[in-house]
Amino acid sequence: GSERTCCPVNWVEHERSCYWFSRSGKAWADADNYCRLEDAHLVVVTSWEEQKFVQHHIGPVNTWMGLHDQNGPWKWVDGTDYETGFKNWRPEQPDDWYGHGLGGGEDCAHFTDDGRWNDDVCQRPYRWVCETELDKASQEPPLL
């Protein structure tokens, strides 16, 4: 498919990316799969400006982003470098808390009600945000 110049229907354009905001909840892996079926990925936050944009659209609701440490180190799903990149964790987070009683720690990052980030159990059914870069999006309906 050739590159497109505008976002798909129901997606929001911002700074050469397209964003889709869910209104239901899924576990992190299911949300990740949803975005990827749309030729997209869970949102990767690379700046304070992008953080404020996403925060404005999701409101005070727990919402998954494309950041996890399920294989050890924290990783953004699109390969963006975590160590040198933008971060907006809540104080004392991430803490890989084991006290929730659900088994294991906390390996997936989400926006909290004030927009700052927390790590949580990946199975929790939170809302999510998909993102795709405008010049990588296809003219077709969503692709793999």
């Epitope: 799969n33 990827r36 079926l37 990925h41 294989n71 390969g79 309906p141 692709l143 793999l144």
Partner: antibody, heavy 120, light 103 residues
Framework: QVQLQQSGPGLVKPSQTLSLTCAIS??????????WNWMRQSPSRGLEWLGR?????????DYAVSVKSRITINPDTSKNQFSLQLNSVTPEDTAVYYC??????????WGQGTMVTVSS | DIQLTQSPATLSFSPGERATLSCRAS??????LAWYQQRPGQAPRPLIY???NRATGIPTRFSGSGSGTDFTLTISSLEPEDFATYYC?????FGRGTKLEIK
């Protein structure tokens, strides 16, 4: 355990329609977390993705630009299968055709493959 | 469209040796890259997804690495059944494959 079973003729005449079916067991064609794909493989083109369908409250269809004017992929919920139709075939469409499911990062389950020869 | 380049087309090894296969993308694909093995007369089967994650049932001698544009599939100690053709894939695009043959 998901399995895909392909069926259809192995010989098609030029200008006619290639029709293949992929029967799904162990999952539903209407699953909202899987995409159902057709691919083909030939020495000249390598592994080539042809198209897919998936369900998200409604059916979506995506086709490769190279075959877009000739291809149709149809799900059949009553038989839990999906099909490929490729119209106006030429000898260049001779290939091994595969159906495959896609979840998350890979085409994880493949049919056994069907060698289709286009010849008069 | 993103192009995936696998080179060389053929590699020769002896059983027990370590094999490293390369895949290069024409632009960054993040970590969204998969590897497949195909034996003669069979369909491809997934080995690695998301660049580093082994698919279900894949032996630990197979590992994947890389991010962005350069990716590697490593087979730590080749078994006789590993001599096959290997493909990388991003979304709907496949590389042309690298054939592992017995030296």
């Amino acid at each position: 355990q998901v399995q895909l079973q392909q069926s259809g003729p192995g010989l098609v005449k030029p200008s006619q329609t290639l029709s293949l079916t992929c029967a799904i067991s162990g999952d539903s064609v209407s699953s909202n977390s899987v995409a159902w794909n057709w691919m083909r493989q030939s020495p000249s083109r390598g592994l080539e993705w042809l198209g897919r369908t998936y369900y998200r409250s409604k059916w979506y269809y995506d086709y490769a630009v190279s075959v877009k004017s000739r291809i149709t992929i149809n799900p059949d919920t009553s038989k839990n299968q999906f099909s490929l139709q490729l119209n106006s075939v030429t000898p260049e469409d001779t290939a091994v055709y595969y159906c495959a499911s896609w979840t998350r990062g890979a085409f994880d389950i493949w049919g056994q493959g069907t060698m289709v020869t286009v010849s008069s | 469209d993103i192009q995936l380049t696998q080179s060389p087309a053929t590699l020769s090894f002896s059983p027990g040796e370590r094999a490293t296969l390369s895949c290069r993308a024409s632009q960054s694909v993040g970590s969204y890259l998969a590897w497949y093995q195909q034996r003669p007369g069979q369909a491809p089967r997934p080995l690695i997804y998301d660049a580093t994650n082994r698919a279900t049932g894949i032996p630990t001698r197979f590992s994947g690495s890389g991010s962005g544009t350069d990716f590697t599939l490593t087979i730590s100690s080749l078994e006789p059944e590993d001599f096959a053709t290997y493909y990388c894939q991003h979304r709907r695009t496949f590389g042309r494959g690298t054939k592992l043959e017995i030296k």
